[in-house]
């Protein structure tokens, strides 16, 4: 029986050009984590294999950094990075646990963004 739960950073926002850390944490299970895959929609960004370590997709190697821990750091964010991200924990003997994070990349800085909506 799968007893574990995944906690994630949930819905997060970041500034264009900046960076963000995507974090998931698997708890309430003694299952062994054999691999964690990070995906954006159906595109594989990175793999952290318990035996062989981190592997970053060649398509993202300039903008994705491993860690901290089993998390993933996205750099040089663009508006196109807005969307759903999934951490997929492959475990034994439980099976697969999936966490979801929604990232919104804001076009303008927080200051500009705030100024645009200030009450006259």
């Amino acid at each position: 029986m799968m007893t574990g739960t995944i906690e994630t950073t949930g819905n997060i926002s970041a500034e264009k050009g900046g960076s963000i850390i995507l974090q998931c944490h698997l708890s309430s299970t003694t299952a062994q984590v054999t691999q964690v895959n990070w995906e954006q929609q159906d595109q594989l960004l990175a793999i952290c294999n318990a035996d062989l370590g981190w592997h970053i997709s060649p398509s993202f190697k300039d903008r994705v950094a491993p860690g901290p821990g089993l998390g993933l750091t996205l750099q040089s964010l663009t508006v196109n990075d807005t969307g759903e991200y999934f951490c997929i924990y492959h475990t034994y003997p439980d099976g697969t646990y999936t966490g979801r994070i929604f990232l919104e990349v804001l076009e303008s800085s927080v200051a500009e963004h705030g100024a645009r909506f200030q009450i006259p």
Epitope: N37, D51, L52, H55
Partner: antibody
Framework: QVQLVQSGAEVKKPGASVKVSCKAS????????IHWVRQAPGQGLEWMGI????????SYARKFQGRVTMTRDTSTSTVYMELSSLRSEDTAVYYC??????????????WGQGTMVTVSS | EIVMTQSPATLSVSPGERATLSCRAS??????LAWYQQKPGQAPRLLIY???TRATGIPARFSGSGSGTEFTLTISSLQSEDFAVYYC??????????FGGGTKVEIK
């Protein structure tokens, strides 16, 4: 050209060990994973494990953990697979195959010719 | 582990006809799927990787499609040398990398 050449056929008794070699040539040996896959007579393909020839890191299928050891000798561009406590069900052709670059993942694009291991009393 | 299921187990086709082989993964493997051909007494040979990219030297009559959990290998016009066993394999989660049980393409 890129190739993997394996050692010759072996006949072993139950309980013994076997060590199969796989010599790589024609490419940068440390840059690509090497996998081991076996095939029992008339059966399908079964993945045994993988080794990173650069770092020596390994990952084994749970079924073989404790019985299989994969090593490499970078000076001769050779990978070894040792299987211990042999039983009759281990009778199979054992293949080494080159996987993706060690920085990412990939299919098995180059295969050795296979080594027949027969376990019989 | 990810279970790969191939169908049919055996496919009887006449030379010149089209053959369609299916492979299903128990969970998404994105496009990290390969197809191999194996003839009796020989090592497997890589045909398709990335679900749809032909390996070096593979004729254009072989094509792969699909993504996620459903994949297809199509041989547009079977030649005599194409009668063999075909395996699919996922290479995104290990251990273990997993193969399908194979589809034998035989002469009708």
């Amino acid at each position: 050209q890129v190739q993997l050449v394996q050692s010759g056929a072996e006949v072993k008794k139950p309980g013994a060990s076997v060590k199969v070699s796989c010599k790589a040539s024609g490419y940068t040996f440390p840059a690509y994973y090497i996998h081991w896959v076996r095939q029992a007579p008339g059966q399908g393909l079964e993945w045994m494990g993988i080794i990173n020839p650069s770092l020596g890191l390994t990952s084994y299928a749970r079924k073989f953990q404790g019985r299989v050891t994969m090593t490499r000798d970078t000076s001769t561009s050779t990978v070894y697979m040792e299987l211990s406590s042999l039983r009759s069900e281990d009778t199979a052709v054992y293949y080494c195959a080159r996987g993706g670059r060690t920085t990412w993942i990939g299919a098995l694009d180059i295969w050795g010719q296979g080594t027949m291991v027969t376990v019989s009393s | 582990e990810i279970v790969m299921t191939q169908s049919p187990a055996t496919l009887s086709v006449s030379p010149g006809e089209r053959a369609t082989l299916s492979c299903r993964a128990s969970q998404s493997v994105s496009s990290n799927l390969a197809w191999y051909q194996q003839k009796p007494g020989q090592a497997p040979r890589l045909l398709i990787y990335g679900a749809s990219t032909r390996a070096t030297g593979i004729p254009a009559r072989f094509s792969g499609s699909g993504s996620g959990t459903e994949f297809t290998l199509t041989i547009s016009s079977l030649q005599s040398e194409d009668f063999a066993v075909y395996y699919c394999q996922q290479y995104v989660v290990w251990p273990p990398l997993t193969f399908g049980g194979g589809t034998k393409v035989e002469i009708k």
